[in-house]
Interface confidence: low
């Protein structure tokens, strides 16, 4: 009898664009054909996907967030066929360049400022807000009630993924008008990624990591 196969992996939590993953269909069986399925479809070999050892070993040369699977392997001989339970990869990735919402850059004096930051990341990233280069809080949402012209400035959302060791940020220049006219939507927006953060955030990056690890 053919045993029900199972998949072993050398790395179930690979990092996107960095790690390779080897999936092995177990056990070794003689006079047996090995088959693979990804997302319920027969495997299509590509430059990033390699089969070896008589199709028993599947190698993903550089994983992406789209490579989670599920993966199944099958074994068959002239008498029967068996298929493994599915295995999924927990691909860690990001954080992508964050998005601050709402997109408004101009606010009326006395209004509430309620900014939310989101970055695609696995696992979810750590969020921090910096205002004019000063670290304010470690939350995904920044709320300031009854803003005034004193609240003008550069609002930066900084995201960090400790699993990938990567970080990212975006800056929005927000202005507060004291007039009665409706505020316009003009303004400047800049984003920084990884080590390319603006100089004013460098000290805060160090402080943030220090704060997080201790």
């Amino acid at each position: 009898e053919l045993p029900k196969p199972y998949i072993s992996s050398n790395n179930s939590n690979p990092i996107e664009d960095k790690d390779a993953v080897t999936l092995t269909c177990e056990p070794v069986a003689e006079n047996t054909t090995y088959l693979w399925w990804v997302n319920n479809q027969s495997l299509s070999v590509s430059p990033r996907l390699q089969l070896s050892n008589g199709n028993r070993i599947l190698t993903l040369l550089s994983v992406t967030r789209n490579d989670t699977g599920p993966y199944e392997c099958g074994i068959q001989n002239s008498e029967s066929a068996k298929r493994s339970d599915p295995v999924t990869l927990n691909v860690t990735y990001g954080p992508d360049t964050p998005i601050i919402s709402p997109p408004d850059l101009s606010y009326r004096s006395g209004a509430n400022l309620n900014l939310s930051c989101h970055s695609d990341s696995n696992p979810s990233p750590q969020y921090s807000w910096l205002i004019n280069g000063t670290l304010r809080q470690h939350t995904q949402v920044l709320f300031i009630s009854k803003i005034t012209s004193n609240n003008n400035g550069a609002y930066a959302c900084f995201v960090s993924n400790l699993a990938t060791g990567r970080n990212n940020s975006i800056v929005k220049n927000i202005s507060v008008s004291s007039g009665d006219s409706a505020p316009g939507s003009s303004g400047l927006s800049a984003s920084g990624s990884g080590s390319g953060l603006n100089d004013i955030f460098e000290a805060q990056k160090i402080e943030w990591h220090h704060h997080h690890h201790h």
């Epitope: 009898e1 045993p3 319920n40 029967s80 298929r83 339970d85 999924t88």
Partner: antibody, heavy 120, light 107 residues
Framework: EVQLQESGGVLVKPGGSLKLSCAAS????????MSWVRQTPEKRLEWVAY????????YFPDTVQGRFTVSRDNAKNTLYLQMNSLKSEDTAIYYC?????????????WGQGTLVTVSA | DIQMTQSPASLSASVGETVTITCRAS??????LAWYQQKQGKSPQLLVY???TLAEGVPSRFSGSGSGTQFSLKINSLQPEDFGSYYC?????????FGSGTKLEIK
């Protein structure tokens, strides 16, 4: 035509034991993984046992683990379910089911069921 | 264990109508979902597996869709023989679990 015929369902007291059988015909029984699925009086379906085509691999849910065993005799085209330490919540219609060939997933063929009642 | 939540618990419809039954998984099951039909006093019969693949002999008025955690079974132009109970089941490894069922009755 695929046929699965369960038997052995009776009234049994709590703590008692019972062995169900499922006679298969109309397909190559020895090539198919098999399961037992039960349907409670509330009409809920619950999977209770799995056995690979050759009988070497079995799986059970936590609710019956250690109390139920599953076996098969491919020479006789028969599947068995041994149920020990029966509880009132084991009362159900028990179906044997054949998985899709080469798969441990969906249940392609079902028997007509046999009623097991556990009551004092 | 993966929990399967099915809705509605019951619905009434007339011959010729189109109905949809939904099933939600407590975690990502990709496309590993099956649907069964059960008529009164009979055993369940496989309708659909792998979310949308019709089992042998199942009429094309049945169709399955969805992925991840949200799935649905649609029956176009209901026929008298379609009335009964319907169950979803994940086949994303053991333990296999079923939804609580949807009873489809004639209006």
């Amino acid at each position: 035509e695929v046929q699965l015929q369960e038997s052995g369902g009776v009234l049994v007291k709590p703590g008692g034991s019972l062995k169900l059988s499922c006679a298969a015909s109309g397909f190559v029984f020895s090539s198919y993984d098999m399961s037992w699925v039960r349907q409670t009086p509330e009409k809920r379906l619950e999977w209770v046992a799995y056995i690979s085509s050759g009988g070497g691999i079995t799986y059970f849910p936590d609710t019956v683990q250690g109390r139920f065993t599953v076996s098969r005799d491919n020479a006789k085209n028969t599947l068995y379910l041994q149920m020990n330490s029966l509880k009132s919540e084991d009362t159900a219609i028990y179906y044997c089911a054949a998985h899709y060939f080469g798969s441990s997933g969906p249940f392609a063929y079902w028997g007509q069921g046999t009623l097991v009642t556990v009551s004092a | 264990d993966i929990q399967m939540t099915q809705s509605p618990a019951s619905l009434s419809a007339s011959v010729g109508e189109t109905v949809t039954i939904t099933c939600r998984a407590s975690e990502n099951i990709f496309s590993y979902l099956a649907w069964y039909q059960q008529k009164q006093g009979k055993s369940p019969q496989l309708l659909v597996y792998n979310t949308k693949t019709l089992a042998e002999g199942v009429p094309s008025r049945f169709s399955g869709s969805g992925s991840g955690t949200q799935f649905s079974l649609k029956i176009n132009s209901l026929q008298p023989e379609d009335f009964g109970s319907y169950y979803c089941q994940h086949h994303y490894g053991t333990p296999f679990t079923f939804g609580s069922g949807t009873k489809l009755e004639i209006k």
